[in-house]
């Protein structure tokens, strides 16, 4: 705090508010009889800048020229030092350093809408740190002038509150902004414009869309605009897209036909307006209109696959599977799938509508030639049917693809490779790669996946519905006319050693050997494709290494004979399972003593 100046005065020249980089003159003088015991030679006047001494002088007054002050406030204090006493504060001064206004740049004016008011913006330039008064002046035809002031440190916008009208759209108006503060003044370059240059139309409103006869090909967009609008820009995109389609139209009078919309797609529409071909600016975009286009009948054909299963001597089970049409092919909400099953020689046909599923299972006689046709229907119609003749897909051994392999390819991908069949490879019309989770029971409810591959391909990357640590049964079919050949392999995308070994559930004696039966390891504990089982045995209470027997893994196998046990010796037996990554811990232990006669 600076005390009142009872003992002396401080004067400041040219002012307490100075221009950055200029010099200030500070004079400190003692009032009569305020020195050190009236001995003026002992008066030592000291000038402080904040808490740092910058000058001193013996006598009644001190004069100091100060330069290089920073922006903002600097505090100076004058003190008197007498011999054998503390310094006494005489008087203080605060000097404020600011900047003269720079020339305002990029002055631009706009009138929002035909009924709006003229408002201008500019760039102030460097902060002056001082109260700066901005005066905006607009001059027009017939010596008309308007003026508006803004008294704020950060002023860069003013609204004249006047409305330019289109009576003489080519008349010139000139705007200029002047900035003044206590350290100087500066004016912008003038900005000259016409009504058409600065009026920015209001964005269009009341946007609607109509589809004649509920057809996407007869679509009209309607909107309302201000009266003088000449040009419009339309932009539209599917709601799930980031890219806009853009259309420029002239003299649209609030309507435009759109010809390239996709059916059954939600679109976002926006419109902008302009008064003149090359003068003025576009309005803001209108509020978005969101609308869904009508359905059209599906295009494309379903990808259909099937599986045959023998039931008994006279019957077989057919399971049909198909993939959903893509959104662009479905062109609407698929209400049902129509499946037609026909015996080709007898002409007997059965049709069924399937809703909510993409599969269908039925039982048919093993005799006769059967065909199916599957199509997808929405509210406007049906897709072309996909026709398939039911055949024994693996019957032609010479068509079986050779050297099928399945290798992990990164996370959750399996690369399946094969060689063409021995029979004339050019006869192959396409390959189908099919995969499903391996379930020991051969469960037909397990989802089936497939992809089609061109006849010249000898590999396919499968990634759909592939999980880590799950074993898949993979089949490659080569199709040629009404014949098919297939080869199969097991594969996984990622594997590790199984979490547990098989559980031995029974050991039985048969003619001097034993038969071990076990329960399969639960699928979630197999951790990939099993390659082998191992059966271990050793004499009870023996420290010797166990003997083992390694059995190649086969899905359906759950028992195995061992004939190298000695009679009337008690053995301990257990099992493990192996994947390519390693061996499981061992399963349960069982004891067994063979009762048969010694050899």
């Amino acid at each position: 705090k600076i005390d009142a100046c009872k003992r002396g005065d401080v004067t400041v020249k040219p002012s307490h508010v100075i221009l950055l980089g200029s010099t200030v003159n500070i004079t400190c003088s003692l009032k009569p009889r305020q020195g050190c015991f009236h001995y003026s030679r002992r008066n030592k006047l000291i000038l402080y800048k904040f808490d740092r001494r910058i000058n001193f002088h013996h006598g009644h007054s001190l004069n100091s020229q100060v330069t290089g002050l920073p922006l903002g406030t600097t505090l100076f204090v004058c003190k008197l030092a007498c011999i054998n006493s503390d310094e006494i504060q005489i008087c203080g001064a605060e000097i404020f350093v600011g900047v003269a206004p720079e020339q305002p740049q990029n002055l631009s004016c706009i009138q929002k809408g035909e009924q709006g008011t003229v408002a201008c913006t500019w760039e102030r330039g460097r902060d002056t740190h001082l109260y700066t008064e901005y005066t905006l002046q607009l001059s027009g035809p017939k010596n008309l002038t308007w003026q508006k002031q803004c008294k704020d440190i950060y002023c860069d916008y003013l609204d004249f509150g006047i409305n330019l009208t289109p009576e003489s759209p080519e008349s010139n108006f000139t705007a200029k902004v002047t900035a003044v503060n206590s350290l100087g003044s500066s004016s912008s370059l003038p900005s000259t414009f016409t009504f058409l240059d600065i009026v920015r139309p209001l964005p269009p409103w009341d946007i609607r869309i109509k589809f004649q006869k509920a057809s996407v090909s007869r679509c009209t967009l309607y909107w309302r605009d201000e009266g003088l609008v000449l040009l419009n820009r339309l932009r539209y995109r599917p709601s799930n897209s980031r890219l806009w389609n853009m259309v420029n139209v002239t003299k649209a009078k609030g309507r435009h036909d759109l010809l390239d919309l996709k059916p059954f797609t939600e679109y976002e529409f926006q419109i902008s307006s302009k008064l003149h071909l090359y003068k003025g600016s576009w309005s803001d975009w209108s509020e978005s209109l969101r609308a869904q286009t009508p359905e059209e009948e599906p295009t494309g054909m379903l990808d259909v696959w099937y599986m045959k299963r023998h039931i008994d001597y006279s019957r077989q089970q057919i399971s049909l599977f198909w993939k959903n049409l893509s959104v662009s092919e479905a062109r609407g909400k698929i209400l049902h799938y129509q499946v037609t099953l026909q015996e080709l020689t007898g002409g007997k046909a059965m049709t069924q509508n399937i809703t909510g599923h993409t599969s269908w299972t039925t039982v048919i006689p093993r005799t006769g030639n059967w065909a199916v046709a599957v199509s997808a229907a929405n509210s406007k119609g049906s897709s072309l049917p996909t026709r398939i003749n039911i055949m024994n897909l693996c019957e032609a051994g010479l068509l079986a693809p050779r050297q099928v392999s399945a290798n992990s390819e990164g996370m959750d991908n399996i690369l399946v490779t094969w060689q063409p069949p021995r029979k004339d490879p050019s006869a192959v019309q396409e390959y189908v790669v099919e995969w499903r989770e391996l379930h020991p029971g051969g469960d037909t409810q397990v989802p089936l996946n497939w992809l089609r591959s061109r006849p010249y391909n000898v590999s396919a990357l499968i990634s759909e519905n592939i999980k880590s640590y799950i074993c898949y049964e993979i089949r490659v079919y080569a199709l040629s006319g009404d014949q098919g050949g297939c080869s199969s392999i097991l594969g996984n995308s990622k594997h590790k050693a199984p979490l547990s070994g098989p559980h031995i559930n029974a050991i039985t004696e048969e003619k001097g050997s034993i038969l071990i039966s076990w329960n399969s390891i639960p699928v979630q504990e197999q951790m990939g494709c099993l390659l082998h089982y191992r059966i271990y045995w050793k004499e009870r209470d023996s420290n010797s290494q166990p003997q083992l027997c390694e059995i190649p893994y086969r899905v359906s196998q759950n028992s195995h004979p061992i004939n190298s046990l000695q009679p009337r010796v008690t053995y301990v037996l257990w099992m493990t399972a192996l994947t390519a990554a390693g061996e499981s811990s061992h399963g349960n232990e069982r004891e067994f003593c063979l009762q048969g006669k010694a050899n």
Partner: nanobody, 119 residues
Framework: QVQLQESGGGLVQAGGSLVLSCAAS????????MSWYRQAPGKQRELVAE???????TYADSVEGRFHISRDNAKNIVDLQMNSLKPEDTAVYYC?????????????WGRGTQVTVSS
């Protein structure tokens, strides 16, 4: 913002004296600088005298030794004692207050009071 009210202007003979007074109201705390400016017809507005909150002063060369500025910080009043007035001192006298506003100064002006010095 600060509101400023000037008083004390009038008609005076050359060589005479006048005291102008300016009272600040509103958010008048922390007024850094109180000043008197004047504007004669057809001329730019010019600084006459100013006094900081600490009591330091500045005078225009043309009034040095004749005019004295003083300030009562408690009441937010600034007085300008004008002695030995000359016809060229005729002008509208404006009071100005500068307040610290962050790292900037915000200014407020009064409406002005007329001083006429006749010869």
């Amino acid at each position: 913002q600060v509101q400023l009210q000037e008083s004390g202007g009038g008609l005076v003979q050359a060589g005479g004296s006048l005291v102008l007074s300016c009272a600040a109201s509103g958010s008048a705390a922390l007024i850094f600088l109180m000043s008197w400016y004047r504007q004669a017809p057809g001329k730019q507005r010019e600084l006459v005298a100013e006094v900081s909150r600490g009591g330091s002063t500045t005078y225009a060369d043309s009034v040095e030794g004749r005019f004295h500025i003083s300030r009562d910080n408690a009441k937010n009043i600034v007085d300008l004692q004008m002695n030995s007035l000359k016809p060229e001192d005729t002008a509208v006298y404006y009071c100005k207050a500068d307040q610290n506003y962050g790292d900037s100064l915000r200014s407020s002006w009064g409406r002005g009071t007329q001083v006429t010095v006749s010869s």
